[in-house]
Interface confidence: low
């Protein structure tokens, strides 16, 4: 209890202070003295919980002394001045510095007053996300990879996607002692529908103001998926030329288109122009099955279309496009 007639003095400090690995940090600590109160501070002391002896002392006549003089410094205390600010700066923060510290004022006539501060040592992680290029496997494989390197505490990684998929996360010690590298794989059964779609890796960490979002554009390599368009079942004799298109989706891109029929090579009225097939006017009915064969680096696939050119008045029908 303070002696009769004295108001109490209070030590003010935050309960927790964050600092970054390798950086410097100030542990703030102030003595709040009521108006008209006579208070004499003879010594400022900092000690770490669980360790004997003081790490930093500032004496009213002898000045400062430190357990590690290159790493500690009273930021405001000066000989000959009133000792009201015990704030201590720590340089080159290490993992081992994390812990509870006591800031203590030795005062007269009130006695000793102290407060505890928790120093939390953080390391801001570096985050990267990359695609894992895959082929059609028929089973779940990692399709994207998100890495948060050198965080303390470890970052939390989650994935956002409307494609389904499953996260698989692992941790290893980081390059700097006390840090952690978190790797998260996003796993899904590859399909052509997934190729070119995006997934987002979200990384959360105490040192971030808001979560970091990293977008990965998925790559699935697959052989061509082929269809033929441009035929509407209404082609008649005497109409002008028409065009069929061989529509192919593939990754990588198609390297070649080859048109043929079930009977062998193309008939004279059909002229191949890459992905397109020009159908010239004919003077007798036709019933032919056309084949488009598309090749890419992973293989070849084909589509078939049976085309009929029928007798009948072209004026009454939509058909081969007119000029």
């Amino acid at each position: 209890w303070p002696p009769p007639g004295t108001g109490d003095v209070v030590v003010q400090a935050p309960t927790q202070v964050p600092g970054f690995l390798g950086d410097s940090v100030t542990l703030p600590c102030y003595l709040q003295v009521p108006n008209m109160e006579v208070t004499h501070v003879s010594q400022l002391t900092w000690a770490r919980h669980g360790e004997s002896g003081s790490m930093a002392v500032f004496h009213q006549t002898q000045g400062p002394s430190y357990s590690e003089s290159k790493r500690l410094e009273f930021v405001a205390a000066r000989l000959g001045a009133e000792l009201r600010n015990a704030s201590l700066r720590m340089f080159g923060l290490r993992v081992e510095d994390e812990g509870n510290y006591t800031c203590l004022f030795v005062t007269f006539p009130q006695g000793s007053r102290s407060v505890d501060i928790w120093l939390r040592v953080l390391a801001k992680p570096q985050n990267t996300a990359e695609v894992q290029k895959v082929q059609l496997t028929g089973e779940p494989v990692p399709m994207a990879r998100c890495v948060s390197t050198g965080g303390r505490p470890p970052a939390q990684i989650t994935w956002h996607s409307d494609l389904g998929g499953m996260p698989n996360t692992s941790q290893v010690p980081g390059f700097l002692s006390g840090t952690v590298t978190v790797t998260s794989l996003w796993i899904l059964v590859p399909s052509s529908q997934v190729d070119g779609k995006n997934v987002t890796c979200k990384v959360e960490h105490e040192s971030f103001e808001k979560p970091q979002l990293l977008t990965v554009n998925l790559t699935v390599y697959y052989p061509p998926e082929v269809s033929i368009s441009g035929y509407d079942n209404n082609w008649y004799l005497g109409q002008n030329e028409a065009t069929l298109t061989c529509d192919a989706r593939s990754n990588p891109e198609p390297t070649g288109y080859n048109w043929s029929t079930t009977m062998g090579p193309l008939p004279p009225f059909a002229v191949a122009q890459g992905a397109q097939l020009l159908i010239r006017p004919v003077d007798k009915p036709i019933n032919t099955t056309l084949i488009c064969n598309v090749t890419n680096a992973l293989g070849a696939r084909q589509a078939e279309l049976t085309v009929q050119v029928k007798e009948g008045p072209p004026s009454e029908h939509s058909g081969i496009s007119r000029n």
Epitope: P153, P154, H160, D162, T169, S170, Q171, V180, T200, K210
Partner: antibody, heavy 115, light 107 residues
């Protein structure tokens, strides 16, 4: 201060459906997944699933697929869980929580399914 | 699904004691484990994440350790307000799974 306000206790008949709500206050609703957890004396804590309110993306525990449907309304910062074709097995306390870096859970909604 | 086997189910203790609760995962979950405390009639409250990191405001008598498949929550110098049920939970893979719980009671 983060707060999660869950809807009040429900007493419902078997075979019906119920929609529980969870209003989030004090943080950016669209930044964090909202998870739902079931608690019973027999099975303890069971994770039902999660929704990311920003994108609407969901993930479910296979056990609760077809039973629970998760939705979120960004304008009111409210997450919902609808439970269908209720049986006595669905009687439990249901919690919502953003989990991960946040410690906060709702106060829980007690659901009783009984004739 | 990953099973989290928690032991013991019940534990009797006295104020000032040191107690440990263990959780064994059925497969490697790195350090992706959270420990929760749940007092009677209340919601669970997270104490530890990433196996060993205390949430701010959690007293330092609560310590988490372990990685891979074996995890421990230790309470040194048990206080009366620590009497509660404790759960572990893995978040390495969906579905997230919890341990069955350990009830801490007074002798």
């Amino acid at each position: 201060e983060v707060q999660l306000q869950q809807s009040g206790a429900e007493l419902v008949r078997p075979g019906t459906s119920v929609k529980l709500s969870c209003k989030a206050l004090g943080y950016t609703f669209t930044d964090h997944e909202m998870h739902w957890v079931k608690q019973t004396p027999v099975h303890g804590l069971e994770w039902i699933g999660t929704i990311h309110p920003g994108s609407g993306v969901t993930a479910y525990n296979q056990k609760f697929k077809g039973k629970a449907t998760l939705t979120a309304d960004k304008s009111s910062s409210t997450a919902y869980m609808e439970l269908s074709t209720l049986t006595s097995e669905d009687s439990a306390v249901y919690y919502c929580t953003p989990l991960w870096l946040r410690r906060d859970w709702g106060q829980g909604t007690t659901l009783t399914v009984s004739t | 699904d990953i099973q989290m086997t928690q032991t013991p189910k019940f534990m009797s203790t006295s104020v000032g004691d040191r107690v440990s609760v263990t959780c064994k995962a059925s497969q490697n979950v790195a350090t992706n484990v959270v420990w929760f405390q749940q007092k009677s009639g209340q919601s669970p409250k997270a104490l530890i994440y990433s196996a060993s990191y205390r949430y701010s405001g959690v007293p330092d008598r609560f310590t988490g350790s372990g990685s891979g498949t074996d995890f421990t929550l230790t309470i040194s110098n048990v206080q009366s307000e620590d009497l509660a049920e404790y759960f572990c939970q893995q978040y390495n893979n969906y579905p997230l799974t919890f341990g069955a719980g350990t009830k801490l009671e007074l002798k």
